[in-house]
Interface confidence: low
């Protein structure tokens, strides 16, 4: 079957869109009237209250969209609104650091529906966005290069959808933790991929199979540059208990958001706070993410790390390739941005069973003390780690070491750092020395050698 | 009544250079966007260049280097410089703005010429 509609063109129910085995059903979306895409517009000089437009010439002019500026669409999730608090959160850190045309797109009345036809309702959101983008293009010369579209979920696909339909001159898509169900393992031209946009990045926070670990968004790689943050299946402040969970600092409703699907919507909340940390997500190439917490994928290459959200699109290498896959860990709870150091520590003094820990004191900050090592601490021996910072400390200026026995020992061991190398992911090393040693739990300062 | 009215067209050889020029009349309050759109026989109206009050233009792609947009808007007027012309630019060439007229608030118009054709021989 196929249904047509004068604005959007025809839709058909025939493979792949139905009838293939991600999605045996067929089933057409529903009207553009019953989806009933809306457009509500955030900007600089409206930043808490949406003016609602339309791809209509009176509509764009008599808003503040503003034509030397870029614009960002934010389209939400299966059963979420255009009104939620985070796509105009997203926004309002968007004005923190530049002035851009914030479109929230609200499709609530085909997302609040059963999954499959959510799924289908999804193509008329992208017809929409894109007749909205070629609107702007015929009617006030606005080149797409200059749109960025940024889809949750469904709305991954939706925004995939307008950039085919577009013919990927869109300048840019954001995936945050496309959905699985329906799209994974499709053709390309059911989901978002890399030829939507002259730019595709994806982050994938909820990467579980949807049988049985209901894990919403997609394993599969489908951008120039794919993140997978703490590996793409659990995030970190995701496991708490039931009523922790639902009693959240944002409140209950987000709380229980949260708790239906808390890794799901963690790819919104890194993606928000990355906006503010421009250099607080950088993602390692690496083999997995096994390989990462093994400590071998530090620092980054030559040719630098891309930054996981906002700054992706700062990455020389961003459209080198396909399918490039970058991982980092993040905090358990925002500001979700961390910073990752390689220290190195040389020891000095007695040879004693225990575990040490370096702390970072650098011109933009200080860091907390990091485990470097558990076990036999021997003089002359090297032990290496790497750890995520929640401060980005700058410039390091000193360290400072402490240790501590595992067992009660009367004769007071001294144990010292005569050297400590912290090297910054960008693979900038300090130096740091000391000829003296401490008794356990006593702090020793280190300075440049 | 607000009017656009194109001239500068005609037959060049290919190589060739045009001038464009449109001119706004009329009840007009202000004017944000003005630009050149063309049709070639049997094809779609399509953008070839446009400029905002603020100076900010926009080419497509395919005409960059070749074509260049300005605007004088004391004058109410665009114009469009046409260089290394090519048998494929023969088209009609329509002036499109952006206008307020006036007593009319915020509201925005499209406005339309008449268009004015560009024939390029080989």
């Known amino acids: 079957k196929e249904v047509c509609y004068e604005r959007l063109g025809c839709f058909s129910d025939d493979s792949p869109w139905s009838g293939i085995t991600e999605r045996p059903l067929h089933i057409l979306p529903w009207s553009p009237k019953d989806v009933n895409t809306r457009f509500l517009l955030y900007t600089n000089e409206n930043p808490n209250n949406f003016q609602e437009v339309a791809a209509d010439s009176s509509s764009i002019s008599g808003s503040n969209f503003k034509t030397n500026r870029k614009t960002r669409f934010i389209i939400h999730g299966f059963i979420d609104k255009g009104e939620e608090n985070w796509l105009a959160n997203v926004c309002k850190n968007l004005f923190k650091v530049e002035s851009v045309n914030c479109i929230c797109v609200d499709w609530k009345g085909g997302s609040r529906t059963g999954y499959t036809q959510a799924s289908q309702n999804i193509r008329i959101v992208g017809a929409e966005v894109a007749y909205f983008v070629e609107f702007l293009q015929s009617a006030f010369g606005y080149s797409p290069s200059n749109v960025h579209v940024i889809g949750h979920s469904l709305g991954a696909h939706a925004a995939g959808e307008a950039g085919r339909r577009t013919n990927g001159t869109i300048g840019r898509i954001t995936g945050l933790d496309p959905a699985e169900p329906c799209f994974q393992g499709t053709p390309e031209l059911v989901r978002l991929d890399p030829s939507d946009a002259k730019f595709v990045d994806v982050i994938h926070t909820d990467g579980a199979p949807i049988v049985p670990n209901l894990g919403f968004g997609m394993s599969q790689v489908v951008g120039h540059l794919d993140f997978f943050p703490n590996g793409g299946v659990e995030m970190p402040g995701c496991k708490k208990n039931i009523l922790s969970q639902i009693v959240d600092i944002d409140g209950i409703w987000e709380g229980t958001r949260d708790f239906a699907a808390c890794n799901h919507l963690r790819s919104y909340k890194y993606y928000t706070d990355s906006i503010v940390n421009p250099d607080g997500f950088a993602g390692f190439p690496c083999a997995s993410y096994n390989v990462f917490t093994a400590n071998k994928c530090f620092p980054c290459p030559s040719g630098g790390c891309p930054q996981m959200g906002h700054y992706a699109d700062r990455y020389p290498g961003k459209t080198n390739d396909v399918g490039q896959k970058f991982y980092l860990d993040t905090g358990d709870a925002s500001n979700f941005a961390r910073w990752r150091y390689k220290v190195s520590v040389t020891l000095s003094g007695k040879k004693v069973t225990g575990h040490i820990l370096v702390s970072l004191f650098g011109n933009k900050g200080n860091s907390k003390q990091y485990e470097i090592f558990k076990g036999t601490l021997k003089p002359d021996s090297t032990h290496s780690n790497e750890f995520d910072s929640d401060v980005d400390v700058g410039d390091l200026q000193m360290v400072k070491f402490i240790w501590y026995n595992n067992v009660i020992n009367p004769t007071l061991p001294r144990v010292g750092a005569s050297k400590i190398i912290v090297e910054t992911n960008v693979g900038k090393q300090f130096n740091f020395c000391s000829p003296e040693t401490v008794r356990e739990e006593v702090l020793l300062t280190l300075t440049p050698c | 009544q607000v009017q656009l009215q194109e001239s500068g067209g005609g037959l060049v050889q290919a190589g060739g250079s045009l001038r464009l020029s449109c001119a706004a009349s009329?009840?007009?309050?202000?004017?944000?966007?003005m630009g050149w759109f063309r049709q070639a026989p049997g094809k779609q109206r399509e953008l070839v260049a446009s400029i905002t009050s603020g100076g900010s233009t926009n080419y497509a792609d395919s005409l960059k280097g070749r074509f260049t947009i300005s605007r004088d808007n004391a004058k109410n007027a665009v114009y469009l410089q046409m260089n290394n012309l090519k048998p494929e630019d023969t088209a009609v060439y329509y002036c499109?703005?952006?206008?307020?007229?006036?007593?009319?608030?915020?509201?925005?118009?499209?406005?339309w010429g008449h268009g004015t054709k560009v024939t390029v021989s080989s």
């Open positions: 009329g009840s007009i309050s202000s004017i944000n966007v």
């Open positions: 499109n703005a952006h206008i307020t007229p006036a007593g009319s608030s915020n509201y925005v118009y499209g406005y």
